[in-house]
Interface confidence: low
């Protein structure tokens, strides 16, 4: 809890947890009780802290920009809004989470830029022939999906250095000379056709392409992907369009340090290096990009990669695609015969998914997502919706929290993969107390200026201690804090400041007394309740509340339940103890000792019943029932009965016989007569 966190300053208090607040009211606690200032707002109010002195900054969201999502076709593509809100500030209390909702809607008829990046190594000769009319066919198909489509073309082979190419003058000039066949010298990447809506121009360009060759199977395609992604102006990528990069190859690609074989050791810099002829000028200088570098640049430039690769390479490129946001893989026929359908399918797959990605300064920040997809279905810990139709809205609950109090704000971008739209999020920690702005330096409230007063407490200068800095280091003797010389200081339950005990806070209750020797929780318990819940614990003893008594306060002083029907306490046969009768008379029982078959003369009162029973025979015995009723008794012939608590009777009969019997009591207090017998009867006179 807040109060047990030991916070001595407002800022320390807020750091305990988002539920904690600080009371900056000047005389809120006794001087020693600094720790009591840190508690939940409700507890502080209950303790008497005025609302305007409670420091409790709350996490909050301030929306800076929230244009509505675009619906339907937009005249101007720069007006398209596909994510809402677009910009906000998130002020977070450390440890406290804040959830905001992000909505994404892929607008209808969104412009598409498609750059066709083709491997022109010798094995792709048949593919070049197949795609001679691709431009017009692709434009025709894409016009069904968007009214604003542009195509571009580039090609790649390999870094033109040994050992990737042969280096004899003849083979540098014609790497296919050994076939024999003429092909172009090996090149890294050529950007041939900037994005255009002129499909015939694309066809023309493709018809003019010639293949090239190299030695090893992997090609330099990743160099080409990097340049196609980052050379935004030269390629012609628009700001407000879907950027598709179709990578067509029948071979694996080199990446990262593969170029060390050729002595190239300068890491790829992720910058555009196209010369005046639009060729990659750093092919023989920079390493291939790593997968990580490619991911960064593709994401940064919203480029969605479509790997169109042959059967042997599909598995390999699927592994790459798993790492690259928004990348898809299509199976290319040997001669690229299915490239048109592959592109259309990949486009439709991309448009059926909305996935969020997070960029920026997220280290140490906890971000969790819940996707709310078609029909409002919730997907916990997911930031992707699939099987969406264009025009559907996907929503995402984004929960953010920061674990601790940093001094910096963070800039984060949440954006749909492949779309230019983004939510800009400024996350700033909310852990300053307003009261810290108002500092009284060398304050008179801190014992002759021995400290600064802020947030209701003193921050003491070096060499001074105590709630009001009243204690110098020379006054730190603890003798006066001990109840006896051999006892621990402040009974081990407090701190000795300036010869006075400041008792610790306890989760169980209050510790007090000049030596912290007392508390209000170390008393006896009755039924698990302190002082039977009928008294207060004061320094180890129960002080019973009115109406209760006893060591445990479990004994009521009320005698109401002891009064019998005739108004006499315990029927005059016992004492009322703790609200219950303790019967003193032998044979007396019942809640008010009202049952007592043995009280008075129990034997003689049964005489008429007994004598009737002895003198009557057969049917006449029925007459005795009434007599016995009057005597409050019944006669039992049973021999098996409990003799505990029974009364033994002897009566002198009319015929001088001695009658003996036993009386017991049933549960209702009625008498039952057992074992009736006559003995010592005088013999009748012997008259002959």
């Amino acid at each position: 809890g807040c109060a047990l966190g030991g916070a001595e300053t407002c800022e320390d208090c807020l750091l305990i947890g988002p539920q904690c607040a600080w009371c900056a009211q000047e005389n809120f606690t006794r001087p020693s009780g600094v720790g009591e200032r840190c508690d939940t707002p409700a507890n502080l109010l209950a303790k008497g802290c005025q609302l305007n002195f409670i420091e409790n900054p709350v996490s909050q969201v301030e929306i800076l920009k929230n244009k509505p999502l675009s619906v339907g076709r937009q005249k101007n593509s720069s007006d398209i809004v596909q994510i809402a809100p677009q910009s906000l500030i998130l002020k977070l209390r450390p440890g406290g989470a804040q959830t905001l909702q992000v909505h994404v809607r892929q607008t209808e008829d969104y412009p598409v830029d498609l750059y066709y990046l083709m491997d022109l190594s010798a094995s792709m000769d048949d593919d070049l022939n197949t795609i001679k009319e691709l431009g017009s066919r692709l434009s025709k198909e894409m016009s069904k999906l968007t009214s604003n489509f542009r195509l571009g073309f580039g090609s790649f082979v390999e870094k033109p250095v040994s050992p990737f190419v042969k280096t004899t003058p003849e083979e540098i000039a014609n790497p296919c000379s050994s076939i024999p066949y003429f092909c172009l010298p090996t090149f890294g990447f050529k950007h041939i056709l900037p994005l255009t809506n002129d499909a015939e121009r694309f066809n023309e360009i493709v018809k003019n392409q010639k293949i090239s060759a190299n030695i090893d199977t992997p090609e330099g395609g990743f160099d080409a992907i990097m340049q196609a992604a980052v050379c935004k102006e030269k390629i012609g990528w628009r700001n407000d369009s879907l950027h598709l990069l179709v990578f067509v190859s029948d071979a694996d690609s080199h990446f990262g340090m593969d170029s060390k074989l050729a002595g190239i050791v300068i890491p790829n810099d992720g910058l555009c290096h196209l010369d005046s002829k639009n060729e990659y000028s750093m092919s023989t200088v920079l390493e291939y990009p790593t997968i990580g570098q490619l991911i960064d640049k593709l994401v940064q430039n919203n480029v969605l990669l479509i790997f169109a690769v042959t059967q042997e390479q599909v598995h390999l490129y699927e592994n790459y695609a798993k790492l690259i946001p928004g990348a898809t893989v299509g199976l290319l026929q040997k001669d690229s015969g299915n490239i048109l359908q592959l592109i259309i399918s990949a486009y439709e797959e991309l448009r059926s998914e909305v996935e969020l990605e997070v960029l920026g300064d997220t280290e140490g920040l906890n971000l969790s997502f819940t996707a709310i997809c078609n029909n409002g279905t919730f997907f916990q810990h997911q930031k992707k919706c699939s099987h969406m139709k264009v025009g559907d809205t996907a929503s995402f609950n984004v929960t953010v929290n920061i674990p601790n109090c940093e001094r910096r704000s963070r800039h984060i971008i949440i954006k749909p993969v492949g779309l230019g739209d983004a939510l800009e999020l400024l996350v700033s920690p909310e852990c300053n107390c307003d009261c810290q702005k108002e500092v009284e330096v060398n304050s008179s409230k801190c014992h002759h200026g021995n400290g600064s007063f802020q947030c209701g407490v003193c921050a003491c200068h070096p060499g001074h201690m105590g709630p009001r800095c009243e204690c110098g280091e020379d006054m730190l003797s603890t003798d006066s804090c001990k109840e006896a010389p051999d006892h621990p200081s402040c009974s081990g339950r407090g701190d000795c400041y300036c010869g006075q005990c400041i008792c610790h806070l306890s989760p169980y209750g209050n510790i007090y007394g000049p030596y912290c020797q007392c508390d209000n929780f170390s008393c006896v318990r009755h039924k698990g309740l302190l002082c039977g819940d009928n008294g207060d614990c004061d320094c180890g003893e129960c002080v019973c509340r009115s109406g209760w008594t006893g060591e445990y306060c479990n004994c009521t002083t009320s005698t109401d339940s002891c009064v019998s029907e005739d108004g006499v306490l315990c029927s005059g046969r016992g004492d009322c103890v703790c609200g219950k009768c303790v019967c003193a008379n032998p044979g007396a029982s019942g809640p008010t000792c009202e049952r007592c078959p043995t009280c008075g003369d129990p034997c003689n009162s049964k005489r008429s019943c007994i004598e009737c029973h002895l003198s009557a025979a057969g049917q006449a015995r029925e007459e005795c029932v009434d007599k016995c009723k009057l005597a409050g008794a019944t006669i039992s012939e049973e021999e098996d009965f409990s003799k505990d608590g029974s009364v033994s009777c002897s009566l002198q009969g009319e015929n001088e016989c001695l009658i003996t019997f036993l009386i017991t009591t049933d549960n209702e207090g009625k008498s039952i007569i057992h074992s009736i017998s006559e003995k010592d009867c005088p013999k009748p006179p012997n008259i002959p």
């Epitope: 969201v61 929306i63 800076l64 929230n66 809402a84």
Partner: antibody, heavy 128, light 113 residues
Framework: QVQLQESGPGLVKPSQTLSLTCTVS??????????WSWIRQHPGKGLEWIGY???????YYNPSLKSRVTISVDTSKNQFSLKLSSVTAADTAMYYC????????????????????WGQGTTVTVSS | DIVMTQTPLSLSVTPGQPASIFCKSS???????????LCWYLQKPGQPPQLLIY???NRFSGVPDRFSGSGSGTDFTLKISRVEAEDVGVYYC??????????FGQGTKVEIK
Amino acid sequence: QVQLQESGPGLVKPSQTLSLTCTVSGGSISSGGYYWSWIRQHPGKGLEWIGYIYYSGSTYYNPSLKSRVTISVDTSKNQFSLKLSSVTAADTAMYYCARYRGPAAGRGDFYYFGMDVWGQGTTVTVSS
Amino acid sequence: DIVMTQTPLSLSVTPGQPASIFCKSSQSLLNSDGKTYLCWYLQKPGQPPQLLIYEVSNRFSGVPDRFSGSGSGTDFTLKISRVEAEDVGVYYCMQGIQLPWAFFGQGTKVEIK
């Protein structure tokens, strides 16, 4: 409950800067979710939104006035202020301050009330 | 910018009779959270405006139930079921969707016949 009160000179000379202050009472200007706004109304005309400020200091201005407007906030005094530079007779109007509870996200939801608390307004005349 | 257009610009009503004021926005005020951010204000003579209705149809606290709002998307209506003398003044609609801008309609003046 929250009340707003505008204050400032009723007469300003052309080309000078108009300065108004709005004092918030009955509540804290630092309460989240509120945008503290200035609106004006030319004689016999409709309402024109000038701009607003969030307690953190973020400001938003009407594009048509943006080059001349500055809105600031002083949380310690529970006040926010308007400065309009290079005034002309066209700036003669009744100036209102208001509390605008605009769309603001929190707990996965948005809430919106509009301008729920207004000051009584102060008349400003621009004349030499 | 979103443009708010109100009709009619003035309205003369007999006490006890109903009245309707219309407001049209240049683009939909339906937000991505499913709420529509439009509100109505009344400015009585010599007073500041007061909030009547928010989010198209929600009456603000203290507003009599003879005032009701309806509409969706771009077209909205404020209805007064039985006009009373104290209802005279200028009524404004305002959009609240395109943060950070707040724009009002040009106002509808309501007077008693």
